[in-house]
């Protein structure tokens, strides 16, 4: 037959790139598959195992006390034991339905109080992004991450992310990484690839949790932090990346066909902690320009 | 027109080690991702793995997991393929491929004969 | 990982007569989209593969309408409804639904 000598002509469905899109969809259902499955088959058994690794397994609240006064160097410490049985509050208290046990980031339960806990303030700017716009049905929610509630408001200056650090025997520390950044903390500013830098003037504040005999349940093949089935170790991705790797624009509203693209490659970049900042025991230090604050969702 | 074109034959000792490459032309080489295929003389085709430029993400065949590493330099819109320990089972045509699902169009390369003999 | 089952082995057929290989699958290549990821290829003797069909069902630029493919979850056909001499080779079905790929055995057509 005649070979043809046309270019790649790409099926940009609702303006995605389909095959870019299913193959990387695949891709990262095959390194949860490979983690957890059996068979290219995931077992009620491994499924359980993904779930406890990233942490929505079950609810428990912890209480985060959030320095809310941009000024203060001092650290904050959490007592979990205490708190544990009832809630506090105060403006400067907020609470976060982390499961404690886990380690790492969460999805966080819709059904606890969310708007209560972490009323959103920026619920009226959505004009300002082309993604909150109402085409083709895409909504995204204010809340769908359990990092979008660590400050009751984010100030134009700076951005507060909560990530979780776990060390050799056990103990548990809350990471909290206080960075400058213009702007508002996604999905309001879905338009910067960039993550910002933490520099050494960022202040790192570790909240030491108790001591539990509650462990992250092990993934079949044994992996922990990078345990991607490559070489080097999985890089986290911020909303523009992920959206990029898939063939999909970052100025087109999403419909809930293209987020299911998505989502093997969230879950996946949560289970393999691709977004967690790994410090070593002795003091949190980062380095200026070394590490950035990658802010995924 | 929309190319992928693969490096020459080669000979090689068993032991050793050959780095095969697929040069793309005609596309935007980070939009989709390169498979690499094996075809042994007389045989059926088998999926050795695949990277995405854009990031180099790799996934690959267990089978061949060790044997290939697939790699991707985006500023020269090229793809490589190590393979090491080589025995005669290695002995092959290998080819890149964009292996696409949707798209009205596919390309493979030509094809890179690899003999390994002592 | 997924086997594709491909039969007959082999298909002698006359110029001018209809071809028909079948194709199966351990398990479905329905995508979550509503399409099914499964191509045919075509290997002509000294040359590479080259894709037939995708999704089933259609046919890549350049292909005559005397190929049609048909199926649907596991199942699938190529056919042709008139060989010609170009249609010799090794024709292979492969799926797209999951990482690894993997291709059928081939189905070798040869012309009586």
């Known amino acids: 037959f005649p070979q043809t000598t046309e270019k790649i002509s790409p099926n940009w469905e609702s303006g995605i790139n389909v095959d870019l899109a299913i193959s990387t969809r695949q891709y990262h259902l095959q390194q949860l598959f490979y983690r957890y499955g059996e068979n290219n088959s995931l077992s009620v058994e491994g499924f359980r195992k993904l779930l406890q690794n990233i942490g929505i397994d079950k609810i428990k609240r912890i209480h985060i006390h959030h320095d809310h006064d941009h000024h203060s160097d001092h650290e904050h410490h959490s007592d979990h034991e205490r708190h544990s049985d009832h809630e506090h509050h105060s403006e400067h208290e907020h609470h976060s339905d982390h499961d404690h046990h886990s380690h790492h980031n969460h999805a966080a339960s819709g059904k606890n109080k969310r708007k209560a806990l972490c009323p959103d303030h920026d619920s009226d700017s959505s004009g300002k992004d082309p993604r909150n716009s109402q085409g083709k049905g895409a909504h995204r929610p204010e809340h769908a991450s359990g990092r979008r509630n660590v400050k009751d408001s984010v100030s134009a200056s700076e951005v507060t992310s909560t990530v979780y650090n776990t060390v050799s025997e056990g103990t548990h520390f809350l990471e909290t990484i206080e960075t400058p950044r213009p702007g508002k903390l996604f999905p309001k500013d879905v338009s910067s690839s960039t993550p910002p830098s933490v520099t050494s003037k960022s202040r790192v504040s570790r909240l030491a949790g108790r001591k539990t005999n509650e462990s992250v349940s092990e993934p079949r093949k044994g992996f922990m932090y990078s345990r991607n089935t490559n070489e080097n170790p999985q890089e986290c991705f911020n909303a523009s990346k992920l959206l990029t790797s898939h063939g999909m624009g970052i100025q087109v509203p999403l419909n809930a066909t293209e987020f299911n693209y998505l989502c093997p490659a969230i879950i996946n970049q949560i289970d393999a902690r691709s977004c967690l900042i790994h410090t070593s025991e002795k003091k949190a230090e980062i380095p200026p320009k070394t590490y950035s604050l990658q802010i995924a969702w | 027109e929309v190319q992928l074109q693969q490096s020459g034959t080669v000979l090689a000792r068993p032991g050793a080690s050959v780095k095969i490459s697929c040069k793309a032309s005609g596309y935007r080489f980070t939009s989709y991702w390169m498979h690499w295929v094996k075809q042994r003389p007389g045989q059926g085709l088998e999926w050795i793995g695949a990277?995405?430029?854009?990031?180099?993400?790799?996934t690959y065949n267990q089978k061949f997991k060790g044997k290939a590493k697939l790699t991707a330099v985006t500023s020269a819109s090229t793809a490589y393929m190590d393979l090491s320990s080589l025995t005669n089972e290695d002995s092959a045509v290998y080819y890149c491929?964009?292996?696409?699902?949707?798209?009205?169009?596919?390309?493979w390369g030509q094809g890179t004969t690899l003999t390994v003999s002592s | 990982d997924v086997v594709m089952t491909q039969t007959p082995l082999t298909l002698s057929v006359t110029i001018g007569q209809p071809a028909s290989i079948s194709c199966k699958s351990s398990q479905s290549l329905l995508d979550s989209d509503g399409k099914t990821n499964l191509n045919w290829l075509l290997q002509r003797p000294g040359q590479s593969p080259k894709r037939l069909i995708y999704?089933?069902?259609k046919l890549d630029s350049g292909v005559p309408d005397r190929f049609t493919g048909s199926g649907s979850g596991t199942d699938f056909t190529l056919k042709i409804s008139r060989v010609e001499a170009e249609d010799l080779g090794v024709y292979y079905c492969?799926?797209?639904?999951?990482?690894?790929?993997?291709f059928g055995g081939g189905t070798k057509l040869e012309i009586k």
């Open positions: 492969c799926q797209g639904i999951q990482f690894p790929r993997t």
């Open positions: 990277i995405y430029p854009g990031n180099s993400d790799t």
């Open positions: 999704l089933v069902s």
């Open positions: 491929t964009s292996l696409l699902l949707r798209s009205p169009f596919d390309y």
